[in-house]
Protein backbone atom coordinates (compact mmCIF):
# COMPACT_ATOMS: atom_id res chain seq x y z
CA UNK A 1 0.00 0.00 0.00
CA UNK A 2 1.41 3.34 -1.08
CA UNK A 3 0.17 6.47 0.73
CA UNK A 4 0.78 9.88 -0.73
CA UNK A 5 0.50 13.09 1.22
CA UNK A 6 -0.55 16.17 -0.71
CA UNK A 7 2.30 18.59 -0.22
CA UNK A 8 1.11 21.43 -2.38
CA UNK A 9 -1.69 23.36 -0.70
CA UNK A 10 -3.89 26.41 -1.06
CA UNK A 11 -5.62 28.22 1.76
CA UNK A 12 -9.37 28.29 1.82
CA UNK A 13 -11.42 31.19 3.12
CA UNK A 14 -14.93 31.06 4.51
CA UNK A 15 -17.61 32.66 2.39
CA UNK A 16 -21.17 32.97 3.70
CA UNK A 17 -24.32 33.75 1.73
CA UNK A 18 -27.97 34.09 2.71
CA UNK A 19 -30.87 32.99 0.49
CA UNK A 20 -33.07 35.97 -0.24
CA UNK A 21 -35.90 37.33 -2.34
CA UNK A 22 -36.18 40.28 -4.68
CA UNK A 23 -39.23 42.46 -5.25
CA UNK A 24 -39.58 42.94 -8.99
CA UNK A 25 -39.17 46.50 -10.16
CA UNK A 26 -37.35 47.44 -6.97
CA UNK A 27 -33.71 47.08 -5.88
CA UNK A 28 -32.53 43.88 -4.20
CA UNK A 29 -29.54 42.67 -2.21
CA UNK A 30 -27.69 39.37 -2.68
CA UNK A 31 -25.88 38.90 0.63
CA UNK A 32 -22.31 37.60 0.85
CA UNK A 33 -19.61 37.97 3.47
CA UNK A 34 -16.05 36.65 3.67
CA UNK A 35 -12.93 36.68 5.83
CA UNK A 36 -11.51 40.16 5.18
CA UNK A 37 -8.08 40.99 3.81
CA UNK A 38 -5.75 43.80 4.83
CA UNK A 39 -5.29 45.16 1.30
CA UNK A 40 -8.27 46.06 -0.89
CA UNK A 41 -6.13 45.56 -3.99
CA UNK A 42 -5.73 41.86 -3.11
CA UNK A 43 -9.48 41.16 -3.06
CA UNK A 44 -11.39 39.83 -6.06
CA UNK A 45 -15.17 39.43 -5.87
CA UNK A 46 -16.98 37.58 -8.61
CA UNK A 47 -20.71 37.02 -8.78
CA UNK A 48 -21.89 34.31 -11.15
CA UNK A 49 -25.36 33.03 -12.02
CA UNK A 50 -26.10 29.43 -12.88
CA UNK A 51 -26.66 29.00 -16.61
CA UNK A 52 -25.42 32.51 -17.48
CA UNK A 53 -22.31 32.70 -19.64
CA UNK A 54 -21.00 36.10 -18.56
CA UNK A 55 -20.29 37.34 -15.06
CA UNK A 56 -22.98 39.02 -12.99
CA UNK A 57 -20.39 41.36 -11.47
CA UNK A 58 -16.67 41.55 -10.78
CA UNK A 59 -14.84 43.78 -8.32
CA UNK A 60 -11.05 43.67 -8.62
CA UNK A 61 -8.13 45.79 -7.41
CA UNK A 62 -10.46 48.19 -5.62
CA UNK A 63 -12.85 48.87 -8.51
CA UNK A 64 -15.52 47.31 -10.71
CA UNK A 65 -14.21 45.24 -13.62
CA UNK A 66 -17.19 44.75 -15.92
CA UNK A 67 -15.57 43.72 -19.22
CA UNK A 68 -16.94 40.18 -18.84
CA UNK A 69 -20.33 41.16 -17.45
CA UNK A 70 -23.34 39.46 -18.99
CA UNK A 71 -25.70 41.68 -20.96
CA UNK A 72 -28.69 40.88 -18.74
CA UNK A 73 -26.96 42.57 -15.77
CA UNK A 74 -25.51 45.57 -17.60
CA UNK A 75 -25.93 48.75 -15.56
CA UNK A 76 -27.86 46.98 -12.79
CA UNK A 77 -25.21 45.79 -10.33
CA UNK A 78 -22.96 47.31 -7.68
CA UNK A 79 -21.00 46.15 -4.66
CA UNK A 80 -20.67 48.24 -1.53
CA UNK A 81 -17.11 49.31 -2.36
CA UNK A 82 -16.39 50.93 1.00
CA UNK A 83 -17.43 47.75 2.84
CA UNK A 84 -15.39 45.24 0.81
CA UNK A 85 -12.33 45.75 3.02
CA UNK A 86 -14.32 44.55 6.06
CA UNK A 87 -15.54 41.42 4.25
CA UNK A 88 -18.83 42.51 2.70
CA UNK A 89 -19.19 41.24 -0.86
CA UNK A 90 -22.96 41.75 -1.06
CA UNK A 91 -24.35 42.73 -4.43
CA UNK A 92 -26.95 45.40 -5.03
CA UNK A 93 -29.19 44.46 -7.94
CA UNK A 94 -31.18 47.33 -9.40
CA UNK A 95 -34.65 47.00 -10.92
CA UNK A 96 -35.11 43.31 -10.08
CA UNK A 97 -36.61 41.26 -12.91
CA UNK A 98 -38.59 38.03 -12.69
CA UNK A 99 -35.78 36.38 -14.72
CA UNK A 100 -33.19 37.28 -12.05
CA UNK A 101 -34.39 34.31 -9.99
CA UNK A 102 -31.95 31.41 -9.74
CA UNK A 103 -28.76 30.16 -8.11
CA UNK A 104 -25.93 32.64 -7.69
CA UNK A 105 -22.35 32.04 -6.65
CA UNK A 106 -20.27 34.50 -4.64
CA UNK A 107 -16.63 33.68 -5.48
CA UNK A 108 -13.89 35.37 -3.47
CA UNK A 109 -10.14 35.47 -3.99
CA UNK A 110 -7.88 37.17 -1.44
CA UNK A 111 -4.22 36.94 -0.45
CA UNK A 112 -5.39 34.47 2.23
CA UNK A 113 -6.98 32.09 -0.26
CA UNK A 114 -10.15 31.34 -2.19
CA UNK A 115 -13.70 30.51 -1.27
CA UNK A 116 -17.19 30.44 -2.69
CA UNK A 117 -20.79 29.92 -1.65
CA UNK A 118 -24.07 29.65 -3.51
CA UNK A 119 -27.34 31.35 -2.75
CA UNK A 120 -30.88 30.87 -3.99
CA UNK A 121 -32.50 34.10 -5.12
CA UNK A 122 -36.25 34.16 -5.57
CA UNK A 123 -38.08 36.92 -7.36
CA UNK A 124 -41.68 38.01 -7.16
CA UNK A 125 -43.76 40.84 -5.85
CA UNK A 126 -44.91 41.44 -2.31
CA UNK A 127 -46.37 44.44 -0.53
CA UNK A 128 -47.84 45.45 2.77
CA UNK A 129 -51.60 45.00 3.11
CA UNK A 130 -53.82 47.70 4.50
CA UNK A 131 -57.07 46.81 6.22
CA UNK A 132 -59.88 49.37 6.41
CA UNK A 133 -63.50 49.45 7.42
CA UNK A 134 -65.66 49.57 4.30
CA UNK A 135 -68.26 52.17 5.17
CA UNK A 136 -69.94 51.83 1.77
CA UNK A 137 -71.05 48.28 2.49
CA UNK A 138 -74.53 47.48 3.77
CA UNK A 139 -73.17 45.50 6.75
CA UNK A 140 -70.01 45.78 8.86
CA UNK A 141 -67.31 44.91 6.30
CA UNK A 142 -63.49 44.97 6.24
CA UNK A 143 -61.49 45.52 3.09
CA UNK A 144 -57.89 44.29 2.82
CA UNK A 145 -55.83 45.67 -0.06
CA UNK A 146 -52.24 45.01 -1.17
CA UNK A 147 -51.05 46.69 -4.38
CA UNK A 148 -48.43 44.25 -5.77
CA UNK A 149 -48.12 40.47 -5.47
CA UNK A 150 -46.64 37.72 -7.65
CA UNK A 151 -47.01 34.75 -7.89
CA UNK A 152 -50.68 34.77 -6.96
CA UNK A 153 -50.92 34.51 -3.17
CA UNK A 154 -53.43 32.92 -0.83
CA UNK A 155 -55.47 35.16 1.45
CA UNK A 156 -56.69 33.97 4.85
CA UNK A 157 -58.67 35.92 7.42
CA UNK A 158 -58.38 35.30 11.15
CA UNK A 159 -59.79 36.86 14.29
CA UNK A 160 -58.59 37.15 17.83
CA UNK A 161 -61.97 36.37 19.35
CA UNK A 162 -62.91 33.48 17.03
CA UNK A 163 -59.53 31.72 16.93
CA UNK A 164 -59.47 28.82 14.50
CA UNK A 165 -62.62 29.98 12.74
CA UNK A 166 -62.82 29.53 8.96
CA UNK A 167 -63.79 32.80 7.30
CA UNK A 168 -63.72 31.54 3.72
CA UNK A 169 -67.53 31.48 3.54
CA UNK A 170 -67.84 35.09 4.66
CA UNK A 171 -64.99 36.56 2.61
CA UNK A 172 -64.36 37.26 -1.04
CA UNK A 173 -60.91 37.68 -2.61
CA UNK A 174 -60.09 39.04 -6.07
CA UNK A 175 -56.84 39.53 -8.00
CA UNK A 176 -56.54 42.37 -10.47
CA UNK A 177 -53.66 42.40 -12.97
CA UNK A 178 -51.58 45.55 -12.77
CA UNK A 179 -50.62 47.62 -15.81
CA UNK A 180 -47.23 45.89 -16.32
CA UNK A 181 -49.11 42.57 -16.76
CA UNK A 182 -47.11 40.64 -14.17
CA UNK A 183 -48.01 41.71 -10.67
CA UNK A 184 -51.52 41.79 -9.29
CA UNK A 185 -53.48 43.87 -6.84
CA UNK A 186 -55.01 41.79 -4.06
CA UNK A 187 -58.39 42.78 -2.66
CA UNK A 188 -60.16 40.72 -0.02
CA UNK A 189 -63.42 41.63 1.67
CA UNK A 190 -64.61 40.17 4.99
CA UNK A 191 -68.32 40.41 5.82
CA UNK A 192 -70.27 40.27 9.08
CA UNK A 193 -67.51 41.58 11.30
CA UNK A 194 -68.18 42.26 14.96
CA UNK A 195 -67.06 45.17 17.05
CA UNK A 196 -64.39 44.90 19.80
CA UNK A 197 -62.37 42.34 17.86
CA UNK A 198 -59.03 42.22 16.08
CA UNK A 199 -59.03 40.83 12.54
CA UNK A 200 -56.00 39.77 10.53
CA UNK A 201 -55.71 39.57 6.75
CA UNK A 202 -52.82 37.21 5.91
CA UNK A 203 -51.42 37.21 2.38
CA UNK A 204 -48.80 34.60 1.47
CA UNK A 205 -46.96 33.15 -1.52
CA UNK A 206 -43.73 31.14 -1.67
CA UNK A 207 -41.65 34.30 -1.32
CA UNK A 208 -43.30 36.39 1.36
CA UNK A 209 -45.94 36.46 4.04
CA UNK A 210 -47.67 39.70 4.98
CA UNK A 211 -50.24 40.43 7.62
CA UNK A 212 -52.54 43.41 8.08
CA UNK A 213 -54.27 43.71 11.45
CA UNK A 214 -57.19 45.92 12.38
CA UNK A 215 -58.72 46.39 15.80
CA UNK A 216 -62.19 47.87 15.72
CA UNK A 217 -63.76 49.25 18.91
CA UNK A 218 -66.63 51.68 19.40
CA UNK A 219 -64.23 54.52 20.01
CA UNK A 220 -61.27 53.84 17.72
CA UNK A 221 -59.66 51.84 14.93
CA UNK A 222 -56.06 50.59 15.28
CA UNK A 223 -54.07 49.19 12.34
CA UNK A 224 -50.79 47.31 12.13
CA UNK A 225 -49.00 45.64 9.22
CA UNK A 226 -45.88 43.54 8.85
CA UNK A 227 -44.15 41.60 6.07
CA UNK A 228 -41.80 38.65 6.34
CA UNK A 229 -39.66 37.15 3.58
CA UNK A 230 -39.66 33.36 3.59
CA UNK A 231 -36.78 30.87 3.25
CA UNK A 232 -33.86 33.08 4.32
CA UNK A 233 -31.23 30.38 4.82
CA UNK A 234 -27.50 30.92 5.31
CA UNK A 235 -24.97 28.71 3.50
Amino acid sequence: LIIGFGISGRHSITVTTVASAGNIGEDGILSCTFEPDIKLSDIVIQWLKEGVLGLVHEFKEGKDELSEQDEMFRGRTAVFADQVIVGNASLRLKNVQLTDAGTYKCYIITSKGKGNANLEYKTGAFSMPEVNVDYNASSETLRCEAPRWFPQPTVVWASQVDQGANFSEVSNTSFELNSENVTMKVVSVLYNVTINNTYSCMIENDIAKATGDIKVTESEIKRRSHLQLLNSKAS
Partner: antibody, heavy 123, light 104 residues
Framework: QVQLQQWGAGLLKPSETLSLTCAVY????????WSWIRQPPGKGLEWIGE???????NYNPSLKSRVTISVDTSKNQFSLKLSSVTAADTAVYYC?????????????????WGQGTTVTVSS | DIQLTQSPSTLSASVGDRVTITCRAS??????LAWYQQKPGKAPELLVY???RLESGVPSRFSGSGSGTEFTLTISSLQPDDFATYYC??????FGGGTKVEIK
Protein backbone atom coordinates in the same frame (compact mmCIF):
# COMPACT_ATOMS: atom_id res chain seq x y z
CA GLN B 1 -4.41 25.15 4.08
CA VAL B 2 -6.27 22.88 1.66
CA GLN B 3 -4.39 19.63 1.15
CA LEU B 4 -5.10 16.40 -0.69
CA GLN B 5 -3.90 13.07 0.68
CA GLN B 6 -4.17 10.09 -1.64
CA TRP B 7 -3.60 6.40 -1.10
CA GLY B 8 -4.10 3.03 -2.76
CA ALA B 9 -2.37 -0.11 -4.02
CA GLY B 10 0.77 0.60 -6.00
CA LEU B 11 1.30 -2.80 -7.66
CA LEU B 12 -1.39 -4.59 -9.63
CA LYS B 13 -1.66 -7.60 -11.91
CA PRO B 14 -3.32 -7.37 -15.33
CA SER B 15 -7.16 -7.64 -15.19
CA GLU B 16 -7.28 -6.42 -11.57
CA THR B 17 -9.06 -3.26 -10.45
CA LEU B 18 -7.10 -0.17 -9.53
CA SER B 19 -8.50 1.55 -6.44
CA LEU B 20 -7.35 4.95 -5.14
CA THR B 21 -8.83 7.32 -2.56
CA CYS B 22 -8.19 11.02 -2.05
CA ALA B 23 -9.03 12.86 1.18
CA VAL B 24 -9.61 16.62 1.31
CA TYR B 25 -8.29 18.46 4.37
CA UNK B 26 -8.55 22.09 5.44
CA UNK B 27 -11.22 23.30 3.09
CA UNK B 28 -14.78 22.92 1.84
CA UNK B 29 -15.90 20.06 -0.34
CA UNK B 30 -18.76 21.76 -2.14
CA UNK B 31 -18.32 24.24 -4.96
CA UNK B 32 -15.48 22.40 -6.69
CA UNK B 33 -14.73 19.63 -9.17
CA TRP B 34 -12.68 16.78 -7.71
CA SER B 35 -10.57 15.22 -10.43
CA TRP B 36 -8.30 12.33 -11.25
CA ILE B 37 -5.40 12.70 -13.68
CA ARG B 38 -2.69 10.26 -14.66
CA GLN B 39 0.74 10.46 -16.24
CA PRO B 40 2.38 7.41 -17.83
CA PRO B 41 6.19 7.27 -17.44
CA GLY B 42 7.86 9.89 -19.63
CA LYS B 43 4.53 11.05 -21.10
CA GLY B 44 2.04 13.86 -20.70
CA LEU B 45 -0.98 14.36 -18.46
CA GLU B 46 -4.22 12.51 -19.13
CA TRP B 47 -7.50 13.61 -17.55
CA ILE B 48 -9.46 10.61 -16.25
CA GLY B 49 -12.59 12.19 -14.84
CA GLU B 50 -14.18 14.26 -12.10
CA UNK B 51 -16.95 14.37 -9.54
CA UNK B 52 -18.62 17.07 -7.45
CA UNK B 53 -19.97 16.93 -3.89
CA UNK B 54 -23.41 15.91 -5.20
CA UNK B 55 -21.98 12.90 -7.02
CA UNK B 56 -22.29 14.26 -10.57
CA UNK B 57 -19.53 12.77 -12.73
CA ASN B 58 -17.75 13.40 -16.04
CA TYR B 59 -15.39 10.83 -17.53
CA ASN B 60 -12.83 10.74 -20.31
CA PRO B 61 -14.69 8.86 -23.11
CA SER B 62 -11.61 6.69 -23.82
CA LEU B 63 -11.73 5.32 -20.25
CA LYS B 64 -15.44 5.64 -19.48
CA SER B 65 -16.28 1.94 -19.74
CA ARG B 66 -13.71 1.07 -17.05
CA VAL B 67 -13.85 4.08 -14.71
CA THR B 68 -15.94 4.79 -11.64
CA ILE B 69 -15.42 7.89 -9.52
CA SER B 70 -17.38 8.11 -6.29
CA VAL B 71 -17.65 10.52 -3.38
CA ASP B 72 -18.11 10.21 0.38
CA THR B 73 -19.04 13.70 1.61
CA SER B 74 -19.20 12.56 5.25
CA LYS B 75 -15.46 11.87 5.10
CA ASN B 76 -14.56 14.56 2.53
CA GLN B 77 -13.15 11.85 0.29
CA PHE B 78 -13.44 10.83 -3.35
CA SER B 79 -12.28 7.61 -4.98
CA LEU B 80 -11.20 6.19 -8.31
CA LYS B 81 -11.76 2.66 -9.55
CA LEU B 82 -10.33 1.50 -12.87
CA SER B 83 -11.23 -2.05 -13.84
CA SER B 84 -9.45 -4.59 -16.06
CA VAL B 85 -6.07 -2.89 -15.89
CA THR B 86 -3.26 -3.60 -18.34
CA ALA B 87 0.38 -2.50 -18.56
CA ALA B 88 -0.86 0.59 -20.44
CA ASP B 89 -2.45 1.80 -17.19
CA THR B 90 0.94 2.04 -15.49
CA ALA B 91 1.27 5.68 -14.46
CA VAL B 92 1.49 8.19 -11.67
CA TYR B 93 -2.10 8.95 -10.62
CA TYR B 94 -2.96 12.36 -9.20
CA CYS B 95 -6.05 13.67 -7.48
CA UNK B 96 -6.75 17.39 -7.80
CA UNK B 97 -9.20 20.12 -6.91
CA UNK B 98 -10.53 22.25 -9.75
CA UNK B 99 -12.28 25.59 -9.44
CA UNK B 100 -15.55 24.93 -11.17
CA UNK B 101 -19.13 23.96 -10.46
CA UNK B 102 -21.86 22.25 -12.46
CA UNK B 103 -24.30 24.68 -14.05
CA UNK B 104 -21.91 27.62 -13.77
CA UNK B 105 -19.84 28.84 -16.70
CA UNK B 106 -16.45 29.12 -15.12
CA UNK B 107 -13.33 27.03 -14.76
CA UNK B 108 -10.43 28.26 -12.69
CA UNK B 109 -8.01 25.42 -13.13
CA UNK B 110 -6.67 22.69 -10.85
CA UNK B 111 -5.14 24.66 -8.01
CA UNK B 112 -4.54 21.91 -5.44
CA TRP B 113 -2.96 18.54 -6.26
CA GLY B 114 -2.06 15.41 -4.39
CA GLN B 115 1.58 14.45 -4.76
CA GLY B 116 0.67 11.38 -6.81
CA THR B 117 0.59 7.61 -6.41
CA THR B 118 2.74 5.43 -8.65
CA VAL B 119 0.72 2.50 -9.95
CA THR B 120 2.52 -0.32 -11.75
CA VAL B 121 0.66 -3.05 -13.62
CA SER B 122 2.81 -6.11 -14.12
CA SER B 123 2.30 -9.87 -14.20
CA ASP C 1 -13.86 15.68 -28.70
CA ILE C 2 -11.83 18.87 -28.63
CA GLN C 3 -8.12 18.34 -29.21
CA LEU C 4 -5.43 20.63 -27.79
CA THR C 5 -2.20 20.92 -29.75
CA GLN C 6 0.80 22.51 -28.08
CA SER C 7 3.80 23.85 -29.94
CA PRO C 8 6.67 23.52 -29.86
CA SER C 9 7.02 20.19 -28.08
CA THR C 10 10.55 21.17 -26.99
CA LEU C 11 11.98 24.64 -26.67
CA SER C 12 15.64 25.48 -26.01
CA ALA C 13 16.22 28.86 -24.40
CA SER C 14 18.61 30.82 -22.19
CA VAL C 15 18.06 32.68 -18.93
CA GLY C 16 16.63 36.12 -19.72
CA ASP C 17 14.99 35.02 -22.98
CA ARG C 18 11.36 35.82 -23.80
CA VAL C 19 9.58 32.51 -24.32
CA THR C 20 6.20 31.91 -25.97
CA ILE C 21 4.31 28.61 -25.99
CA THR C 22 1.21 28.13 -28.14
CA CYS C 23 -1.85 25.99 -27.55
CA ARG C 24 -4.43 25.47 -30.31
CA ALA C 25 -7.89 24.01 -29.76
CA SER C 26 -9.64 22.06 -32.52
CA UNK C 27 -12.76 24.15 -31.89
CA UNK C 28 -13.60 27.25 -29.86
CA UNK C 29 -13.32 26.92 -26.08
CA UNK C 30 -13.95 30.63 -25.40
CA UNK C 31 -11.45 31.56 -22.68
CA UNK C 32 -11.73 28.32 -20.68
CA LEU C 33 -8.06 27.41 -20.73
CA ALA C 34 -5.53 26.86 -17.97
CA TRP C 35 -1.73 26.59 -18.03
CA TYR C 36 0.40 24.43 -15.71
CA GLN C 37 4.08 24.03 -14.95
CA GLN C 38 5.47 20.64 -14.01
CA LYS C 39 8.95 19.75 -12.79
CA PRO C 40 10.32 16.18 -12.80
CA GLY C 41 8.89 14.02 -10.03
CA LYS C 42 6.46 16.73 -8.90
CA ALA C 43 2.76 17.39 -9.34
CA PRO C 44 1.82 20.12 -11.84
CA GLU C 45 1.24 23.65 -10.55
CA LEU C 46 -1.41 26.03 -11.83
CA LEU C 47 -0.01 29.18 -13.46
CA VAL C 48 -2.87 30.75 -15.39
CA TYR C 49 -6.63 30.17 -15.52
CA UNK C 50 -9.35 31.55 -17.76
CA UNK C 51 -6.68 32.07 -20.47
CA UNK C 52 -5.17 35.20 -18.94
CA ARG C 53 -5.73 35.31 -15.17
CA LEU C 54 -2.59 34.76 -13.15
CA GLU C 55 -2.98 32.36 -10.24
CA SER C 56 -2.19 33.86 -6.84
CA GLY C 57 1.54 33.65 -6.01
CA VAL C 58 2.69 33.11 -9.60
CA PRO C 59 5.46 35.54 -10.69
CA SER C 60 4.31 38.36 -12.98
CA ARG C 61 6.81 37.32 -15.67
CA PHE C 62 4.22 34.69 -16.63
CA SER C 63 1.25 35.82 -18.70
CA GLY C 64 -1.46 34.17 -20.73
CA SER C 65 -3.49 35.45 -23.64
CA GLY C 66 -5.89 34.35 -26.36
CA SER C 67 -9.45 33.16 -26.74
CA GLY C 68 -11.44 30.91 -29.03
CA THR C 69 -8.94 28.48 -30.54
CA GLU C 70 -5.51 30.09 -30.14
CA PHE C 71 -3.79 30.66 -26.81
CA THR C 72 -0.30 31.60 -25.69
CA LEU C 73 1.72 31.40 -22.49
CA THR C 74 4.55 33.91 -22.34
CA ILE C 75 7.50 34.06 -19.95
CA SER C 76 8.86 37.60 -20.33
CA SER C 77 12.32 36.86 -18.94
CA LEU C 78 13.18 33.22 -18.39
CA GLN C 79 14.60 32.40 -14.95
CA PRO C 80 16.58 29.29 -13.89
CA ASP C 81 13.53 28.04 -11.96
CA ASP C 82 11.38 28.15 -15.13
CA PHE C 83 13.04 25.21 -16.91
CA ALA C 84 10.19 22.67 -16.78
CA THR C 85 7.36 21.19 -18.84
CA TYR C 86 4.27 23.32 -19.51
CA TYR C 87 0.77 22.02 -20.23
CA CYS C 88 -2.40 23.72 -21.39
CA UNK C 89 -5.78 22.32 -20.36
CA UNK C 90 -9.29 23.02 -21.58
CA UNK C 91 -12.35 23.41 -19.33
CA UNK C 92 -12.03 20.69 -16.64
CA UNK C 93 -10.82 18.03 -19.07
CA UNK C 94 -8.19 17.39 -21.71
CA PHE C 95 -4.56 18.50 -21.63
CA GLY C 96 -2.25 19.49 -24.43
CA GLY C 97 0.76 17.30 -25.18
CA GLY C 98 3.16 19.49 -23.22
CA THR C 99 6.11 21.77 -24.02
CA LYS C 100 9.47 21.07 -22.44
CA VAL C 101 11.54 24.22 -21.88
CA GLU C 102 15.18 23.22 -21.63
CA ILE C 103 18.49 25.05 -21.26
CA LYS C 104 20.10 26.00 -24.58
Amino acid sequence: QVQLQQWGAGLLKPSETLSLTCAVYGGPFSGYFWSWIRQPPGKGLEWIGEINHSGNTNYNPSLKSRVTISVDTSKNQFSLKLSSVTAADTAVYYCARAGGDYGFYYYYGMDVWGQGTTVTVSS
Amino acid sequence: DIQLTQSPSTLSASVGDRVTITCRASQSISSWLAWYQQKPGKAPELLVYKASRLESGVPSRFSGSGSGTEFTLTISSLQPDDFATYYCQQYNSYFGGGTKVEIK
